[in-house]
């Protein structure tokens, strides 16, 4: 039961996790414009992974997107790269996930197929919310870098004619919401392989018992046999106990001829 | 890479007209805003007027109701109508582009000295 709830459990936190990498993505507000310190204030800029949005101080908002892929640089196109991946590894790790439930029932899908499958799944879901908690770290490496740079500029003066940007970029609304989700989608991996180790059907584990006839020394064997020289009433190596260890009483040596040499 | 051009300064008296102009050649990303700026001798940078892609407007409290800003979309221009021109309006007048492409641009003009005195 524990099992089936952690199970699940690790699905519903994974797949909110994932609708918040999906999000993330297509947000526009990755990077929002730092209003302190800026003269300009007829125009707002927020930017996204695939456009950059104005809001005037009208309150027209337009929205275009970075139709050259060799002018944006390369970081972004990492944060990109790191991003989707993240989405297709959840979105393959949910459809996985989805036959892995113990609370579905596939067929005659035994146990331990359901078990590597939730396994699979886990792994899927940690890289997943890894890649997305990556992603976001390198954008908001990159935001806090042209901040301080810009802020350099901000006081040069009008010294070089080409300057960099003076409008500075802060943490936008889908970082946030990257770190969160990333997060939710590690945690249900971790929730998934932790679920996986009660599916796997367990070896039977039988009890550590000496057996002992009387009057001859008789080994025993950890694959469940009983050794005997050959002669005796197991020549065959047949299992002598299933489900379970047997006493001493229930396994009885009678002295044979060949008892004594 | 876009080169700015600007041209229409000089000496004017107090109170008399000037009209700046900015050409930017080169492939512009579609939301931008062009403006002026202007730096006197000891100063720090100062906003003039911007004009944005989108048609919104803004002035430097100090200009207000006496310098027009406008913008040609067509020909990636803009011009600064400036009157009635007080001493204190002294000052090397930038032309400035700045582009919201990822993390915006700024491109900057030579500047055009603009005095005004008796």
């Known amino acids: 039961m524990a099992v089936t709830a952690c199970q699940g459990l690790g699905f519903v936190v994974s797949l909110i996790g994932i609708a918040g990498i999906i999000a993330a993505t297509c947000m526009d507000q990755w990077s929002t414009q730092d209003l302190y310190n800026n003269p300009v204030t007829a125009v707002f800029n927020y930017q996204g992974l695939w456009r950059s949005c104005v809001r005037e101080s009208s309150g027209f908002t337009e929205c275009r997107g970075y139709f050259t892929l060799l002018g944006l640089p390369a970081m972004l196109q990492a944060v990109r790269a790191l991003m989707i991946v993240g989405i297709v590894l959840g979105a393959i790790g949910l459809l996985v996930s989805i036959f892995a439930l113990k609370c579905i029932r596939i067929g005659s899908m035994e146990d331990s197929a359901k078990a590597n499958m939730t396994l699979t799944s886990g792994i899927m879901f940690i890289v997943s919310g890894l890649c997305a908690i990556a992603g976001v770290s390198v954008f908001a490496n990159m935001l806090v870098t042209n901040f301080w740079m810009s802020t350099a500029n901000m006081y040069t003066g009008m010294g070089g004619m080409v300057q960099t940007v003076q409008t500075r970029y802060t943490f936008g609304a889908a970082l946030f919401v990257g770190w969160v989700a990333g997060g939710l989608t590690l945690i249900g991996g971790v929730m998934m392989c932790i679920a996986c180790r009660g599916l796997a059907p367990e070896e039977t584990n039988y009890k550590a018992v000496s057996y002992h006839a009387s009057g001859h020394s008789v080994a025993y064997k950890p694959g469940g046999f009983k050794a005997s020289t050959g002669f005796g009433s197991n020549t065959k190596n047949k299992k002598i106990y299933d489900g379970g260890a047997r006493t001493e009483d229930e396994v009885q040596s009678y002295p044979s001829k060949h008892d004594y040499v | 890479e876009v080169q700015l051009v600007e041209s229409g300064g000089g000496l004017v008296q107090p109170g008399g007209s000037l009209r700046l102009s900015c050409a930017a050649s080169?492939?512009?990303?579609?939301?931008?805003?062009m403006g002026w700026w202007r730096q006197a001798p000891g100063s720090q940078r100062e906003l003039v007027a911007i004009?944005?892609?989108?048609?919104?407007?803004q002035y430097g409290d100090s200009v207000k109701g006496r310098f027009t800003i406008s913008r040609d979309n067509a020909k990636n221009t803009v011009y600064l109508q400036m009157a009635n021109l007080k001493p204190e309006d002294t000052a090397v007048y930038y032309c400035n582009v700045h582009t919201y492409d990822f993390l915006g641009r700024d491109y900057w003009g030579q500047g055009t000295q603009v005095t005004v005195s008796l």
């Open positions: 004009a944005t892609s989108g048609g919104s407007i």
């Open positions: 080169g492939s512009i990303f579609g939301l931008n805003f």
